[in-house]
Interface confidence: low
């Protein structure tokens, strides 16, 4: 093994390097010193480092490590952040289109139901958007509210247009009758199933992406332990104390140090792998009624069919509801 | 027969939005994201190695620093970590991750559980309990086409409704939508390319 080069007799090189880290040279010895106060760069002979320099090296080593960690995760972080934003916007576009398709269906096929239908449809799709973004709304309640609101308008405008406008009292009765008599057949239940399944999946997909960002942010801004700070200093800077400015750490040594410093972070690995594979499984299942794009953009058609179902059974329904809500109607006619 | 929104191109009950070259749907975008994420599946286990390869490490030099002295790169001394009498790596590894990492692990465990719960079996389109009152899940033919549901002749096929890189030229807002016909028969040119939502590399 070749003998190590003699230490810099005047600490000149060390001084000029250290000046870049810390302007002002008051901490750098003029000539090598025993260094008995050093705690990290334990000297084998005279050294060009002081305790204060060691502290500065530790701080710099820690900052280097934090920057390396951030640059390591930059591409991954960008990938998830941008996709989370893109999908959120895309889902909002889908909801907007679905609302517009449904409104257009009402305008083209049931103009007498507008503008009330527009209002109910708008409220429904606002709730859909809020649900996707994480609001604590029950999907079944959203669908029930849509049909509860629509039926009184359908009854008074399509099935029984002779009724006076002041239908406030009968409205409550009609809302109740809507569920009791299964006025829309099984369509509300069908829509509930499709909408709840597709929205749940969409919501969890967005939640998962946002958690991905949180995971990267957490590991991006980790503080490293003192022991780690010392090991990094030893690896990156202690050679300078001997005037060895150009030497680099041995590869195997670096790996041991990094594994020590990263012991906690590497713990995430198992759960990160599982996260990506579980997300893949979810994405593979996002079709048919688990694909909100598919479900929401077809809603106008199912709602249309549900109104047709009501119209088909209008005769029977009008008779039953006439009896059921007679009390409310009499009060209105007075 | 059903009436459709006038702003959609209707062809034999197959609902289409105008064809876009190199069309990119939401589902293809999702799959693309997963493929890219999978290239980062070993991100955390590879971090120590990544950081060493991106910080100054002796690669071509004959000599390297082992934490205590200058040694030959392939010597036994270089392989040792040069930490004896200094820091005990075992002591360093006694401890688990710091609290913020523990918290994020707990959150990952939770989301993984949710994701597994939500990963649905790829079977019938509708739940069995929806088949009462004459609703059939039906067979919609090829996998591209999705059954939206309906009753009897009300079954509709929807083919790739929303092209990912497109948006309707006008937003079908009811105020703007032409309302002079009951039966919808729009022309091809009523639908145009949407704005790009941005590419992720």
């Amino acid at each position: 093994q070749p003998p190590p080069p003699p230490p810099d007799a005047t600490c000149h090189q060390v001084r000029s390097f250290f000046q870049r880290l810390q302007p002002g040279l008051k901490w750098v010895p003029e000539t090598p010193v025993p260094g008995s106060d050093l705690q990290v760069c334990l000297p084998k002979g005279p050294t060009c480092c002081s305790r204060k320099m060691e502290e500065k090296y530790q701080l710099t080593a820690r900052l280097n490590m934090e920057q390396l960690l951030q640059s390591a995760s930059m591409e991954l972080k960008f990938l998830i952040i941008q996709n989370a934003a893109v999908f959120q916007e895309a889902f909002e576009i889908v909801v907007r289109h679905a609302k517009n398709y449904t409104n257009a269906m009402f305008k083209n096929n049931y103009p007498s139901l507008t503008p009330q239908a527009f209002e109910f449809v708008g409220e429904f799709f606002t709730d859909v958007s809020l649900y996707i973004l994480g609001s604590d709304i029950n999907v079944d309640d959203m669908v029930n509210e849509l049909f509860d609101s629509l039926f009184p308008v359908i009854y008074t405008q399509l099935m029984n247009p002779g009724l006076p406008d002041s239908a406030l009292d009968i409205n409550e009765c009609l809302r109740g009758a809507r569920r009791d008599l299964k006025v829309f057949g099984n369509f509300p239940k069908l829509i509930m199933t499709q909408v709840s399944k597709s929205l749940q999946v969409t919501r969890i997909f967005l939640q998962a992406l946002n958690l991905g960002i949180e995971v990267i942010n957490t590991t991006d801004h980790l503080k490293f332990s003192k022991d780690c700070g010392r090991m990094l200093t030893r690896m990156w800077y202690c050679s300078y104390c001997q005037g060895l400015m150009m030497v680099k750490p041995c590869g195997g040594y670096c790996n041991v140090v990094m594994q020590g410093c990263m012991a906690g972070v590497v713990e995430i690995d198992k759960y990160w792998r599982e996260y990506i594979l579980s997300l893949e499984e979810l994405v593979n299942g996002m079709y048919r009624i688990y694909d909100m794009e598919n479900v929401l953009l077809g809603l106008f058609s199912t709602i249309h069919d549900s109104i047709q179902y009501v119209q088909k059974n209008a005769g029977k329904l009008t008779t039953t509801i006439g009896k059921l809500c007679a009390h409310s109607q009499q009060r209105q006619y007075r | 027969s059903a009436y459709y929104p006038e702003d959609l191109f209707i062809d034999k009950k197959v609902l289409k939005v105008a064809h876009v070259e190199h069309e990119e749907t939401l589902s293809s975008r999702r799959r693309e994201l997963i493929q890219k994420l999978k290239s980062f599946i070993s991100f955390y286990s590879a971090l120590p190695g990544y950081i060493c390869s991106h910080s100054p490490v002796a690669e071509n030099d004959t000599l390297c620093w082992n934490g205590q002295e200058l040694v030959e790169r392939y010597s036994q001394k270089a392989a040792r970590n040069g930490m004896k009498n200094q820091f005990n790596l075992h002591e360093l590894k006694m401890k688990g991750p710091e609290p913020v990492v523990s918290q994020i692990i707990d959150k990952l465990k939770h989301i993984n559980q949710l994701l597994r719960t939500m990963s649905m079996p790829k079977g019938r389109v509708l739940d069995k309990n929806l088949d009462e009152e004459g609703f059939e899940s039906g067979d919609c033919g090829d996998d591209e086409d999705e059954c939206i549901g309906g009753s009897g002749d009300g079954m509709i096929k929807v083919k790739n409704q929303l092209r990912f890189l497109a948006e309707l030229a006008y937003d079908l807002d009811v105020d703007d939508a032409p309302g002079n016909s009951q039966q919808a028969t729009p022309k091809d040119n009523e639908i145009s390319t949407f704005h790009n939502l941005g590419n992720v590399h």
């Epitope: 503080k223 332990s225 003192k226 713990e267 | 006694m94 401890k95 688990g96 991750p97 710091e98 692990i105």
Partner: antibody, heavy 124, light 108 residues
Amino acid sequence: QVQLQESGGGVVQPGRSLRLSCAASGFTFSSYAMHWVRQAPGKGLEWVAVISYDGSNKYYADSVKGRFTISRDNSKNTLYLQMNSLRAEDTAVYYCAKEGTYYYDSSGYWDYYYGMDVWGQGTT
Amino acid sequence: DVVMTQSPLSLPVTPGEPASISCRSSQSLLDSDGYNFLDWYVQKPGQSPQRLIYLGSIRASGVPDRFSGSGSGTDFTLKISRVEADDVGVYYCMQALQTPWTFGQGTK
């Protein structure tokens, strides 16, 4: 809240074996080193063994080295102490204890700490 | 191994009076960062031990401010400014600087 519950104690003949368990709840078990400490009847506390958060590192008191084995199952949130070749002087109440938490110093570093901040009720 | 020696081994105190327990280690418990790796625990009759003080002087959460820890290197003291009836028990010091962790004999 954070809880540790030991079990598995009993009376056995010298030379025989026994396995103690410690069920943990209320904290992220897999993030903390865990200890066994014992107390002979009418005597003081004696530290027995410690295991790192992931089970990769274990340290023992000289009096039990080679006879006792500390282990953990993070999936079950359980700590174990396998005691072989038991002697009369091993008679004691055995406590499991969770190691202390991190502390931050003024420069923003966090550091390790190996004291014990939560103890179980003990098993004899 | 680091040997921990406590004194006195028994300390009768009247409620309302102060109390002081001493603990000495066979080698310094001060680490390079200036922390003393010494804990104080109390074991009340029929109960498990509980931590009072860690790192020489930091009170564990929930511990009344009547308790204080002081000292550095090899000499440490636990003080109770005003003893209450509930403070009856055996007090132990323990070093956590290196394995094996070692306890003092206890002060009753």
